[in-house]
Interface confidence: medium
């Protein structure tokens, strides 16, 4: 539930659709000009838990292109540049909102969808399970 | 641009608004039930570049609550549990889509907005600038 201080200049909404269906202006207000994660930083190469970026494309989704991180190694890169399997490279995941065309192929009708994406990788100490 | 084979059952859209303004169903299709990042994993504590999660709250935005990562240290945690300043903890950032109420305070009218959020931190080798 979101607190909504009602503005008298709002578009009308029929009760049967409210608050499920809303109008959304797709002219994105973008505070960030760089949308290619490969150009935004080279952390994916310099990290001790490096990752590759894979392009996930779906024309029925908005945005249609999402970049997914896949950790390169199970372990982490140590000071000598070797993979240390005493540590683990793990993906950092985030839930993001996307718009899914609904009904399919409709240009102006969408449904909000939450998807889980891997944004990058981090190096963690493994959880050790001791066997009695 | 993406070619969209038009579905005859789509809602109508007036040309003057098309394709800027679309209808969006806010009944989120959610494949992931856990939305609190503190509960989803303990990577933020176990990472060699640990981070804290800060709650960013804005009722004029959807989603109104977003969790932001802030790296705990400039350096990374070494095998002894100490901060090693020869390495750097850096935030992994991602651009995400949110809905911003427009006009302000309207319950059923939004504009898409891209915001940059820090999702977690990773440990990177620093860039060394050699002075001639």
């Amino acid at each position: 539930g979101i607190t909504i201080p009602r503005n008298p200049g709002c578009p009308n909404s029929e009760d049967k659709n409210f608050p499920r269906t809303v109008m959304v202006n797709l002219n994105i207000h973008n505070r960030n000009t760089n949308t290619n994660p490969k150009r935004s930083s080279d952390y994916y190469n310099r990290s001790t838990s490096p990752w590759n970026l894979h392009r996930n494309e779906d024309p029925e989704r908005y945005p249609s292109v999402i970049w997914e991180a896949k950790c390169r190694h199970l372990g982490c890169i140590n000071a000598d540049g070797n993979v240390d399997y005493h540590m683990n490279s793990v993906p950092i995941q985030q839930e993001i909102l996307v718009l899914r065309r609904e009904p399919p192929h409709c240009p102006n009708s969408f449904r909000l969808e939450k998807i889980l994406v891997s944004v990058g990788c981090t190096c963690v100490t493994p959880i050790v399970h001791h066997v009695a | 641009g993406i070619t969209i084979p038009r579905n005859p059952g789509c809602p109508n859209s007036e040309d003057k608004n098309f394709p800027r303004t679309v209808m969006v169903n806010l009944n989120i299709h959610n494949r992931n039930t856990n939305t609190n990042p503190k509960r989803s994993s303990d990577y933020y504590n176990r990472s060699t570049s640990p981070w804290n999660l800060h709650r960013n709250e804005d009722p004029e935005r959807y989603p109104s609550v977003i969790w932001e990562a802030k790296c705990r240290h400039l350096g990374c945690i070494n095998a002894d549990g100490n901060v090693d300043y020869h390495m750097n903890s850096v935030p992994i950032q991602q651009e995400i889509l949110v809905l911003r109420r427009e006009p302000p305070h309207c319950p059923n009218s939004f504009r898409l907005e891209k915001i940059l959020v820090s999702v977690g931190c990773t440990c990177v080798t620093p860039i060394v600038h050699h002075v001639a």
Epitope: G1, I4, R6 | N36, R55, E57, D58, P59, S64, V65
Partner: antibody, heavy 125, light 107 residues
Framework: EVQLVESGGGLVQPGGSLRLSCAAS????????MAWVRQAPGKGLEWVAT????????YYRDSVKGRFTISRDNAKNSLYLQMNSLRAEDTAVYYC??????????????????WGQGTLVTVSS | DIQLTQSPSSLSASVGDRVTITCRAD??????MHWYQQKPGKAPKLLIY???NSEIGVPDRFSGSGSGTDFRLTISSLQPEDFATYYC?????????FGQGTKVEIK
């Protein structure tokens, strides 16, 4: 522990002005929406105004719009209510209120979990 | 504005009684309904938030239920310290509104 302490109440003539203050402690003040709620003698509770953490967004009940101004100074952990053109019907105990600190759900924390002791404003000639 | 109507306005009950106070909104407030207890000369105290969540430190004899427009606060076994006035609050839309209050008195 969250503490809210109001001050600035008193007796004022109709048409006069008063500035209420609320000193907050025990939490990261700038992260939270804050509000003023009032209660006329022997009556129920009435929400007056709310302000966002940054101070950039404010909301008022219609009867005080244009007369009252809610503001905050995050550097001083202080919330204010500037009351102008006071009327007899503004007579009340004014409470400063803040949201919960521990709630981690996805709904904005805009209800009032913590309250000050209140400060009495009496508008009378 | 969303109007909240509490009933009853007052009630007399004995220690150990089960007491239910209702709050009806004239339009849906979804789950954004909260309950407060106030004693004379004191600030209100949050009991229940978001319909049914108990505030830390609130005895488990207090419970909340309902959705949309109809909500209930139940005290399963009234104790001497529970004699007070109870208010519901909606934070679904501005202006936030409180119910008119329900005074619980000793029979």
């Amino acid at each position: 522990e969250v503490q809210l302490v109001e001050s600035g109440g008193g007796l004022v003539q109709p048409g006069g002005s008063l500035r209420l203050s609320c000193a907050a402690s025990g939490f990261r003040f700038s992260d939270y929406y804050m509000a003023w709620v009032r209660q006329a003698p022997g009556k129920g509770l009435e929400w007056v105004a709310t302000i966002s953490g940054s101070g950039g967004t404010t909301y008022y009940r219609d009867s005080v719009k244009g007369r009252f101004t809610i503001s905050r100074d995050n550097a001083k952990n202080s919330l204010y209510l500037q009351m102008n053109s006071l009327r007899a019907e503004d007579t009340a105990v004014y409470y400063c209120a803040s949201p919960p600190q521990y709630y981690e759900g996805s709904i904005p924390r805009l209800w009032f979990a913590h309250w000050g002791q209140g400060t009495l404003v009496t508008v009378s000639s | 504005d969303i109007q909240l109507t509490q009933s009853p306005s007052s009630l007399s009950a004995s220690v150990g009684d089960r007491v239910t106070i209702t709050c009806r909104a004239d339009e849906s407030v979804r789950t954004l309904m909260h309950w407060y207890q106030q004693k004379p000369g004191k600030a209100p105290k949050l009991l229940i938030y978001l319909v049914s969540n108990s505030e830390i430190g609130v005895p488990d004899r207090f419970s909340g239920s309902g959705s949309g427009t109809d909500f209930r606060l139940t005290i399963s076994s009234l104790q001497p310290e529970d004699f007070a006035t109870y208010y519901c609050l909606q934070t679904h839309s501005y202006p936030y509104t409180f119910g008119q209050g329900t005074k619980v008195e000793i029979k």
